[in-house]
Every structure is written in structure tokens, then in C-alpha cells.
């Protein structure tokens, strides 16, 4: 596990002629924020493909107003690093997309207007634990200067964050088969890193990131015992060969969260929601007040500054948690209607609508029939971003302009002959059949499967299909 860190140094006009106009003006002040998207390997994927390694958003930069007559300078940047945590091994090669977004603080009563100013992309090789790498990328007339690095989260070390380092148990040397951890010579390399949360008692790995179970244990983290005894109330899949599965201790069993924190299971581990005044992985850090500046991501601290007083953080848009430490994934609620693509910009949700739909949440079905006339008495039907005409009898085609051949589909059954008629079609039935489509056989004794024919119409007469 580790963190990819991106530091934006400047965003402004690139060298050479054709300097871009400032994105902000006295009439339309604005501010910038950045989004980074990481993908493993060196593949050149579409910008919309998932950020499999992770993604992050910056805070919003200071509000900027261009001074009349001044050239577009480097624009004021948001505070802090963009951090993309990764759970498993660092891949060594990766693709990145860095987007510069502009928020206009203009006259949009419904909220701010968002627009993508620039997007740069690249493919790089990078070893974890190395120094900051500096980069310059150009997008049109704009230039973005930034640095990046990947660092391992202790106790992981190495260029892929797959080795573990532990303090030495003996003062002089490491255990059998384990080397000293450079540059931490006072620590020893530990066995390779299994999948996060893999049971140390019942699981093992031969490759980084995997979790293979010892006999008698199962589950993705080898925490579920396989029981061959009969189950009174099986809660897992049961079979004659394996018996039934009894859920073993889950990551929240025994509540690892201290100080009244509540535990919730995550796919690979657990997460503590801490009460006010506590934070940390297990809510173990206490005695925090506003004087300690506990709120992340620009959150404002509310509450007493004295040690006995709890605090709360008022979080900026896009963040939540007792310390504003959690980014809100509002796209998980699937707010975009009618198949729209959701984009969480952190400070606002943006829905990219499919053709034929509009609105902040793609909730408006555009009037596909506006200005579209259906000929010959046809009526227009909306749907799916395209208009369709429901045509009157005898007409067809997209706009009901074509005279339809009602007999083209061979509607008369049992060898009946079809005749086009001004109001539809008429079937002349073969001997022994009757009905509008000649679908009913006439019984040998002369009776029919239908009620008596209407007066003046003998079985075998042409039946007009209305």
C-alpha cells in the first residue's frame, strides 16, 4: 500500500506566441481546481475509462479576477497536494490524466458553471520511494508544471511497496533469509505483502497481493472456517463434500475502534467512524481540540479551544467525516437519470447526458417531436432521443410519407389471398378457412369455430380486416 502524490507548481500560458486569454475576468471571476486520474500500465486508454489505480481532486484555488490590460499570469493554485492512495502493489508503469477545471463565479443563480480548461496525459515509469519527478506538459496554449512521486505506507517498502520492514528482533542481524532494509539498516525485510487483511494465522501468499488459505479455512481473507459438522442455520453455501460454511471472525468482530468509534466492514478491511475529539485508524488519537487544527481539506473547526471541549468540523463541499477527511462519492447514488454518465467533481456533481436528454440530472426528455410533422394523419411519439411516427392505416416510413403495402407482410393465413383496400387489407380465404386473416378452419359438418357469420356474409367470402 502507498500513496501517489502530485504537486501542481503552476498553470499558466505556455511560451511562444498566441498566449491564451485569461480564463477569468472582472465580470466573471473564477477559480481553478485539478483532477488526477491514474491507470496501471502504459496503455493509452480513453479519458472516460476507469481510473483503476485511483483518482483525486484538489481543493478549489483562490478566487481570481483578471486585472484589465494585464497579460494572463500563472493562475492562483489550490492549497496542498493531490493524493491518490493505492492499496496493493505500485505497478511501476502508469498512465495519468491531469485535468484543470475552472469554476466561474458569474451570474448562474443555479450554482457555479464548470468547464474543463485543459487536459494533459502521459505515460511514465516510476519506482515507489524515489525522489520527486518534475514534469511540464502543454495543452494548447496552456502549460502545466508539476511534480509527482509514489511513496509506500509503512511498513511497506521497495520499488513496488511489496516488501515489509520490521524493527530488528535481535540487535545484530536479521532472521534467516531476510535482508536488512535499505535505507533503514536498523530494520529487517519481512516476508512479502499478502493481500490487505489476509489472516496472518490462516492465510499465506506466494505472490504479492494474494491470499491463499490453509486447509480448513476459506473466504477472500481466509477468515471463514470450513466446518464439516451439520449446520442448524447455514449462512453460507453448503455441499456434501465441504459441509457448510460458518462465518468466521469478521474484521469488525470485537470492535477494533476505540473510544466509542463504530466499525464498518470494507471489502478488504474495516473503517472506524470516530466520535468528536478522536481520530486515527482506530479512533485511538484523543484529546484533540480546535487548537490542534484537526480539520482537513479546508474544514472550519467549531467548538472549544480548551482541552476538555470536543470539536466538530464544518466541511467544504465534497468532503465529510469527523475531520473532513473522507471524500464524498456521490456518484455511487446514481443520480444521473436516463443513462447519463456521472462525474463527481468534488464540489459538484456533473451529469453528461445521452442524446435526447438534458438537465442537471438528465431528467428532461427533450421534445423529440418539436418541429417534426408526421404526414398523412400520423402522430409523433417521443422516446430515447429520437422521434418516431405512428402512422395511419395505409401509410409507413419515418414520416408516414410512404404509402404502405398492407399485403407485404403476407397477413392472410392458410393460403388466403391479400387485397389492398383503402382502409387496410382484405383477405380472400381459401376453401375451408374463414376469419379476418383466414385463421379459423371451417368444420367439416359446415359449422364454424366462430359464432354465426353476420348476415349477408358466407364462409369463404373475403373478410375485410379492419
Amino acid at each position: 500500500a502507498g500513496v501517489f502524490e502530485l504537486q501542481i507548481h503552476s498553470f499558466g500560458p505556455g511560451p511562444g506566441p498566441g498566449a491564451p486569454r485569461s480564463p477569468c475576468s472582472a465580470r466573471l471571476p473564477c477559480r481553478l481546481f485539478f483532477r488526477v486520474c491514474l491507470k496501471p500500465g502504459l496503455s493509452e486508454e480513453a479519458a472516460e475509462s476507469p481510473c483503476a489505480l485511483g483518482a483525486a481532486l484538489s481543493a478549489r484555488g483562490p478566487v481570481y479576477t483578471e486585472q484589465p490590460g494585464a497579460p494572463a499570469p500563472d493562475l492562483p493554485l489550490p492549497d496542498g497536494l493531490l493524493q491518490v492512495p493505492f492499496r496493493d502493489a505500485w505497478p511501476g508503469t502508469f498512465s495519468f490524466i491531469i485535468e484543470t477545471w475552472r469554476e466561474e463565479l458569474g451570474d448562474q443563480i443555479g450554482g457555479p458553471a464548470w468547464s474543463l480548461l485543459a487536459r494533459v496525459a502521459g505515460r511514465r515509469r516510476l519506482a515507489a520511494g524515489g525522489p520527486w519527478a518534475r514534469d511540464i506538459q502543454r495543452a494548447g496554449a496552456w502549460e502545466l508544471r508539476f511534480s509527482y512521486r509514489a511513496r509506500c505506507e509503512p511498513p511497506a517498502v521497495g520499488t513496488a511497496c511489496t516488501r515489509l520492514c520490521r524493527p530488528r528482533s535481535a540487535p545484530s542481524r536479521c532472521g534467516p533469509g531476510l535482508r536488512p532494509c535499505a535505507p533503514l539498516e536498523d530494520e529487517c525485510e519481512a516476508p512479502l505483502v499478502c493481500r490487505a487483511g489476509c489472516s496472518p494465522e490462516h492465510g499465506f501468499c506466494e505472490q504479492p497481493g494474494e491470499c491463499r488459505c490453509l486447509e480448513g479455512w476459506t473466504g477472500p481473507l481466509c477468515t471463514v472456517p470450513v466446518s464439516t459438522s451439520s449446520c442448524l442455520s447455514p449462512r453460507g453455501p453448503s455441499s456434501a463434500t465441504t459441509g457448510c460454511l460458518v462465518p468466521g471472525p469478521g474484521p469488525c468482530d470485537g470492535n477494533p475502534c476505540a473510544n466509542g468509534g463504530s466499525c464498518s466492514e470494507t471489502p478488504r478491511s474495516f473503517e472506524c467512524t470516530c466520535p468528536r475529539g478522536f481520530y486515527g485508524l482506530r479512533c485511538e488519537v484523543s484529546g484533540v481540540t480546535c487548537a490542534d487544527g484537526p480539520c482537513f481539506n479546508g474544514g472550519l473547526c467549531v467548538g472549544g479551544a480548551d482541552p476538555d471541549s470536543a470539536y466538530i468540523c464544518h466541511c467544504p463541499p465534497g468532503f465529510q467525516g469527523s475531520n473532513c477527511e473522507k471524500r464524498v462519492d456521490r456518484c455511487s447514488l446514481q443520480p444521473c437519470r436516463n443513462g447519463g454518465l456521472c462525474l463527481d467533481l468534488g464540489h459538484a456533481l456533473r451529469c453528461r447526458c445521452r442524446a435526447g436528454f438534458a438537465g442537471p440530472r438528465c431528467e428532461h426528455d427533450l421534445d423529440d417531436c418539436a418541429g417534426r410533422a408526421c404526414a398523412n394523419g400520423g402522430t409523433c411519439v417521443e422516446g430515447g432521443g429520437a422521434h418516431r411516427c405512428s402512422c395511419a392505416l395505409g401509410f409507413g416510413g419515418r414520416d408516414c410519407r410512404e404509402r404502405a403495402d398492407p399485403c407485404a407482410a403476407r397477413p392472410c393465413a392458410h393460403g388466403g389471398r391479400c387485397y389492398a383496400h383503402f382502409s387496410g387489407l382484405v383477405c380472400a380465404c381459401a376453401p375451408g378457412y374463414m376469419g379476418a386473416r383466414c385463421e379459423f378452419p371451417v368444420h367439416p359438418d359446415g359449422a364454424s369455430a366462430l359464432p354465426a357469420a353476420p348476415p349477408g356474409l358466407r364462409p369463404g367470402d373475403p373478410q375485410r380486416y379492419l
Epitope: 481543493a59 483562490p62 489550490p78 463565479l105 443555479g110 487544527g293 472550519l300 464540489h347
Partner: antibody, heavy 119, light 112 residues
């Protein structure tokens, strides 16, 4: 351009409640920022009264907390100040101001409105 | 509460000369998580609302002339006007936003 405009009575009697409204144009008060009230007695310095955030959370100056309520009307894009049990010491120019989470700075100020407390 | 104290209360400087205003807080305004000092400087001209000049103790607001600069960390901060202009006559306030918001009492800058 974001604009803030204070409105309300210029004269309030002692012991009554001072009520002011700030009308915001050019930006939705539910999108971002914390929306503050700050006052300045004639010839004196600035005093922060409190704020309401884009999501409706409030925070007040401890010295005024027992008398202050800040609320909002999102349909009109307005936020309001109520200060109860006023005295002559509450005579001041009252400003509505928006603050930026990123910098924790008071970015943009209304022109201010003078409220006099007198019988 | 954090108390902000400015010095001097007033200052008379010749045009083109340097003006220096000091601000001291009763506790540190440095946030070790963000590596920022949450101190801002404001300028208020007669009959106008204040306007932000400097934030994070030393970052100049867009559009503010570069003769204005801020420095300092922790509890002691300084606003410097390197070459005073006639339009700089105003009252200057420091403000902390580390915990709640409090302003200094103000420093009046005049031309000598």
C-alpha cells in the same frame, strides 16, 4: 460577479431584535462558501459575528452566541441575521461577507448597512 | 479566544518610503497538517468595506500590487508596503482564521 447586498431597518430600539438580510446575486449560497456577518462600530475595528455554510451549518462568536441566530432562505438566495436584546453597544455598520474554505479568508464584502440602536 | 494585537496604532510615512505593520497573536496560527499560517491582511479605505490583500500570511491576493508583502509565522507577522503610494492611505487589519475569526484593532497609515 458575486454581489452581496445588506438590507434592514437602520434604527432599532434598545432591548428589541435587530434583523438584517443579505441578498446574494451571481452565486448560489448552497453551492459553496461560508456566509458571514461582520460588524464595525463607528470609528472602531471589525468584529466577526458568525457564519452559515453552504449546507446550513452555523457557527457564532462565543461572546455573542446567546443573542445571535443566522438563517437562510435558499429560494430567495438570502441569508439573515437576528441579534436579540440589543443595546447602544450594538450600533455598527453590519457587513455580509463570503469566506473561502480553501484560504479561510473573507473574500468579498457587501457595502455594509448602518444600524443605530437608540430609543 | 485568540487575541490579535497590532502595532503601531497609526503610522505616518513619506511617499515612496517603506511602511511596516506588525501583528501578534496570542497563540500560534500555524497548522502543521496544511503547513499554512492562517493569517490574512485587509485594507479598508474610508467609506468602503475591507478588501483582502494577503492570505496564508504571505500569499498575495490576485490583483494586489506587489509592493504589498506579508511575512512571519507562528505568532508574529508583518505587512510591508515597500514604497507607499497616495492610494495606500487606509486602515489595515490583520485577521486570524485558525480558530474562529478575530481581527486586530487596526493600524491607520497616513502620508507624512
Amino acid at each position: 460577479q458575486v454581489q452581496l447586498q445588506e438590507s434592514g431597518p437602520g434604527l432599532v430600539k434598545p432591548s428589541e431584535t435587530l434583523s438584517l438580510t443579505c441578498t446574494v446575486s451571481g452565486y448560489s449560497i448552497t453551492s459553496d462558501f461560508y456566509w458571514n456577518w461582520i460588524r464595525q462600530p463607528p470609528g472602531k475595528g471589525l468584529e466577526w459575528i458568525g457564519y452559515i455554510t453552504y449546507d446550513g451549518s452555523t457557527n457564532y462568536n462565543p461572546s455573542l452566541k446567546s443573542r445571535v441566530t443566522i438563517s437562510r432562505d435558499t429560494s430567495k438566495n438570502q441569508f439573515s441575521l437576528k441579534l436579540s436584546s440589543v443595546t447602544a453597544a450594538d450600533t455598527a455598520v453590519y457587513y455580509c461577507v463570503y469566506g473561502d474554505f480553501n484560504r479561510h479568508a473573507m473574500d468579498y464584502w457587501g457595502q455594509g448597512t448602518l444600524v443605530t440602536v437608540s430609543s | 479566544d485568540i487575541v490579535m494585537t497590532q502595532s503601531p496604532d497609526s503610522l505616518a510615512v513619506s511617499l515612496g518610503e517603506r511602511a511596516t505593520i506588525n501583528c501578534r497573536s496570542s497563540q500560534s496560527l500555524f497548522n502543521s497538517r496544511t503547513r499554512k499560517n492562517y493569517l490574512a491582511w485587509y485594507q479598508q479605505k474610508p467609506g468602503q468595506p475591507p478588501k483582502v490583500l494577503i492570505y496564508w500570511a504571505s500569499t498575495r491576493e490576485s490583483g494586489v500590487p506587489d509592493r504589498f508583502s506579508g511575512s512571519g509565522s507562528g505568532t508574529d507577522f508583518t505587512l510591508t508596503i515597500s514604497s507607499l503610494q497616495a492610494e495606500d492611505v487606509a486602515v489595515y487589519y490583520c485577521e486570524q482564521s485558525f480558530y474562529l475569526f478575530t481581527f486586530g484593532q487596526g493600524t491607520k497609515v497616513e502620508i507624512k
